[in-house]
Interface confidence: low
């Protein structure tokens, strides 16, 4: 426990102290006091440097004194023979004696008292930065106006820390600038910009005057910049010694201004700004950048647009452009996105045609569609060549993205009809000579295939059976052969509106407009035995002249049989209508004058007994196309006749082309390609 005073006596005092003794006393007075130690008696064996016996006074690590020998007071009014004054509150006294004493020595008597110390003046190191105030047992520090006492209760400073600057540009100055800055202060300023900007400090030479360095080159007052692990400074002196611009490469900067107690100058003023991080102008193939600039910096946004034929693929979605932003780290966003060649994908297949598997389906690749020749041709032109276009579609120069249509070639038999041995007014024929020939089994009749979905026949064939069964592709109509041929299923029968329906068809005398169309449920596949006949053109080239030859075919009555099992055909000439009028009607059901002859009818035959007959109805009267000798068109349809083996009457198809086209158009269903 600290005490205010005390006594210290050598062992056995006032008797002689013993040999070989070492004893110590720890003196402690209260905090804030010093110690006055004084000796009133001193009788210790004398030796050089008090080596034998001694009393030692120690303050901390410092020896305040070492005593031996005899002392007496110089002052008759004071008993004090030796004294010590220490400004500390602790002191140690150590007494030592060696193994022998030549004489008898009585030792020492000493006293200590606590004394007030003046902390403001008694120490080399001044305890207060500004004003020091002593009191008994302690002191306190105080500050001049506008200064405040720091937490250490010793140092005064100005309130110049804690400012945080976040604006992209700004100005910072030392306190009171350009008046002298405060002494003994530490000012800290923080600049915190958003990521993507580096702090650039600009300090003009003339805006800087800070107490110069000492002889060793150490700044007494200093300005330091700290950016992450990089430090700029310390700077001091008259005129800024650093660079005009300090590029910190960081968005965070700490500015530390430290001053000592002496030598105040005007200080400093600086400007800073946020310099956006640059992003490199990258070479992105197959694209253009907008806007185009020499330099891109943080927050710049560019639109990267792919060149024609290239696209950005992200997941499953294709786009032609994307935005990229210069980011805070100096890298572009969306940098993984690239302009890749557009992929048009596997081309769609087409009915009755094919496309070779392409080597590549990327932009610029070329494919070729072909139709199944010689039975189909490309209706809508364009040559069948498509290239992979920039929009990801296969495109043809003529058709654009529209696919080619393979439509049946009409009027071209695989084998031409040649009249062989004569068979009662006609010859045996093969279905390949007349691949358009359609067989109706009820009533036994014929028809002509004009495209994939439509059969042309005579109205009187279908008026009594609106769901006829039809066959194509067979020369023979024996039941066993028909089973192997292609059966056609009707969807709807369209009889010409000008055909007069009768309650008793057997008594018919008016065969005007004897024409009908049968729409098929499914398209017919063309080949060597199944192929359509052409329709006549509407020009005068297709007006028949007397003597023009045409071919008829069918399984109708011959001179030997009511019905033919194998296909028969004949070549016969067009005749004037009067020739047909002049023939006496066989088994008339009415007066000869009642039979109607109209311009919608063609009269043909009369040569060598060649004629169509019962069972041939609806079959085509095929005439060579005047504009393309390789093709046949349906000039007529077997309609009626006054007498088999003479002249026959055929519906003049040319007069019905408009009706045929209109009916087909209005009743076509979109193809499911």
């Amino acid at each position: 426990e600290p005490t205010m005073y005390g006594e210290i006596l050598s062992p056995n005092y006032p008797q002689a102290y013993p040999s070989e003794v070492e004893k110590s006393w720890d003196i402690e007075v209260p905090e804030g006091y010093g110690i006055h130690l004084y000796f009133t008696h001193l009788d210790i064996e004398l030796s050089e440097n008090c080596a034998y016996d001694s009393v030692q006074i120690i303050s901390g690590d410092t020896e305040e004194g070492r005593l031996c020998g005899q002392r007496s007071s110089n002052n008759p009014h004071s008993p004090i023979v030796e004294e010590f004054q220490v400004p500390y509150n602790k002191l140690q006294v150590i007494f030592k004696s060696d193994f022998s004493n030549e004489e008898r020595f009585t030792g020492f008597a000493a006293y200590y008292v606590a004394t007030d110390i003046n902390e403001c003046t008694d120490f080399v190191d001044v305890p207060c930065s500004h004003f020091c105030n002593n009191f008994i047992g302690g002191y306190f520090c105080s500050c001049p106006p506008e200064y405040f006492l720091h937490d250490d209760m010793k140092n005064c400073g100005v309130n110049c820390s804690g400012d945080v600057f976040t604006a992209l540009i700004g100005e910072i100055a030392s306190p009171n600038y350009p008046k002298p800055y405060p002494e003994n202060s530490r000012c800290e300023y923080q600049i915190r910009l958003e990521k993507g900007f580096q702090v650039v400090v600009t300090l003009r030479r003339e805006d800087f005057d800070v107490e110069a360095a000492d002889s060793a080159g150490n700044c007494l007052d200093s300005l330091v910049f700290v950016a992450g692990d990089r430090q700029f400074g310390p700077y001091c002196g008259h005129g800024f010694p650093g660079p005009l611009n300090i590029e910190t490469k960081s968005n965070a900067l700490d500015i530390i201004f430290q001053t000592d107690l002496t030598g105040q100058k005007k200080g400093w003023k600086l400007r800073y700004h946020g310099d956006p991080m640059p992003c490199p102008k990258e070479d992105t193939p197959n694209s253009v950048w907008e806007p185009a600039k020499a330099k891109y910096v943080f927050r710049d946004v560019v639109q990267i647009t792919c060149l024609d034929g290239f696209e950005v693929v992200e997941g499953r979605v294709g786009a032609t452009s994307f935005y990229s932003t210069c980011q805070s780290n100096g890298k572009w966003s969306n940098s993984k996105l690239k302009c890749q060649p557009v992929d048009c994908g596997i081309p769609e297949s087409i009915e009755n045609g094919k496309v070779e598997d392409p080597e590549s389906t990327l932009f610029g690749s070329v494919i070729r569609y072909t139709c199944e020749e010689p039975y189909y041709y490309m209706e809508n032109g364009g040559g069948g060549e498509y290239h992979c276009a920039g929009n990801g579609s296969w495109v043809n120069e003529v058709l654009g993205p529209e696919l080619p249509k393979c439509v049946p070639v009409c009027g071209v038999p695989r084998e031409p009809f040649e009249e062989k041995q004569r068979i009662i007014g006609g010859s045996d024929a093969d279905i390949k000579n007349f691949p358009w020939q359609v067989f109706f089994d009820n009533p036994w009749a014929g028809g002509a295939l004009i495209n994939e979905y439509w059969v042309l026949t005579a109205a009187h064939v279908v008026e009594g059976n609106r769901e006829p069964t039809m066959y194509v592709g067979s020369t023979s109509v024996q039941t066993s052969r028909l089973a192997k041929s292609k059966m056609l299923t009707p969807e709807h029968v369209f009889i010409h509106p000008g055909w007069k329906l009768l309650e008793v068809p057997e008594g018919r005398t008016n065969f005007d407009n004897d024409i009908a169309l049968v729409r098929l449920k499914d398209p017919v596949k063309m080949g060597p035995t199944v192929s359509p006949i052409c329709l006549p053109g509407t020009s005068s080239d297709y007006n028949l002249m007397d003597g023009d030859l045409g071919l008829i075919s069918g399984w109708g009555r011959t001179e030997k049989r009511d019905r033919a099992v194998r296909l028969k055909a004949a070549r016969l000439p067009v005749a004037p209508l009067r020739k047909c009028k002049e023939v006496k009607v066989e088994k008339p059901t009415a007066d000869a004058e009642a039979y109607v002859f109209t311009p919608n009818m063609i009269c043909a035959g009369g040569e060598k007994g060649m004629d169509s007959c019962k069972g041939d109805s609806g079959g085509a009267f095929a005439v060579q196309d005047p504009n393309d000798k390789t093709k046949f068109y349906a000039a007529g349809l077997v309609s009626w006749g006054p007498q088999c083996g003479t002249y026959g009457l055929y519906t003049r198809v040319k007069n019905y082309v408009d009706w045929i086209m209109k009916t087909m158009q209005e009743n076509s269903t979109p193809r499911e390609d």
Epitope: L168, I169, V288, A292, K295, R299, T305, T325
Partner: antibody, heavy 119, light 105 residues
Framework: EVQLQQSGPELVKPGASVKISCKAS????????IHWVKQSPEKSLEWIGE????????TYNQKFKAKATLTVDKSSNTAYMQLKSLTSEDSAVYYC????????????WGQGTLVTVSA | DIVLTQTTAIMSASPGEKVTMTCSAS?????MYWFQQKPGTSPKRWIY???KLASGVPARFSGSGSGTSYSLTISTMEAEDAATYYC????????FGGGTKLEIN
């Protein structure tokens, strides 16, 4: 609210120079380019150039390279355009405009400054 | 520089009528931009990226086109649409069209 406030009309003599200003407010001035556009009855709208207020980098339309000088004063958030060697063909309304981070330039416009060159 | 041509300098339309104005570029560009300007005021950004409407632009406006041919369409004309419309490109150094003044009958 983003605002670009331009200086008032100017009547200047042929051969002289003029400096017009565009004070920005309501946004971080150094964050966006400032463009200048000329509008005259004869030539409709013409882009003069742009300046990056942070770096002071400029890009000019070739036609105006010898005519216009673009500068900024970051401390006052103000952009300037100086036009020199003025002739009657320079009589026009001049606009400053700010771009945006995204798909378009000229997102915000000043109210325009009418410059009349007349003896 | 890319030259933008607005062939119709002045056109008029009645309220409710459909209006289409065109702008052709001297060479192919990626996107077209349109501005609207009324007398005594600054131009306003109207359509960007060829077909996107700037904020506040009525849905009756639309933009379309590609390559060198672009157009701005108003599906049903209203009195407030009377103004001058400028086309603008920035595929190279920015340029503007001469403007089409749309008047109301």
């Amino acid at each position: 609210e983003v605002q670009l406030q331009q200086s008032g009309p100017e009547l200047v003599k042929p051969g002289a120079s003029v400096k017009i200003s565009c004070k920005a407010s309501g946004y971080s001035f150094t964050g966006y380019y400032i463009h200048w556009v000329k509008q005259s009855p004869e030539k409709s709208l013409e882009w003069i150039g742009e300046i990056n207020p942070t770096t002071n980098d400029t890009t000019y339309n070739q036609k105006f390279k010898a005519k216009a000088t673009l500068t900024v004063d970051k401390s006052s958030n103000t952009a300037y355009m100086q036009l020199k060697s003025l002739t009657s063909e320079d009589s026009a309304v001049y606009y400053c405009s700010r771009d945006i981070s995204g798909p378009a330039w000229f997102a915000y416009w000043g109210q325009g400054t009418l410059v009349t060159v007349s003896a | 520089d890319i030259v933008l041509t607005q062939t119709t300098a002045i056109m008029s339309a009645s309220p409710g009528e459909k209006v289409t104005m065109t702008c052709s570029a001297s060479s192919s560009i990626s996107y077209m931009y349109w501005f609207q300007q009324k007398p005594g005021t600054s131009p306003k950004r109207w359509i960007y990226d060829t077909s996107k409407l700037a904020s506040g632009v009525p849905a009756r406006f639309s933009g379309s086109g590609s390559g060198t041919s672009y157009s701005l369409t108003i599906s049903t004309m209203e009195a407030e649409d009377a103004a001058t419309y400028y086309c603008h490109q920035r595929s190279s150094d920015p340029t503007f069209g001469g403007g089409t003044k749309l008047e109301i009958n």
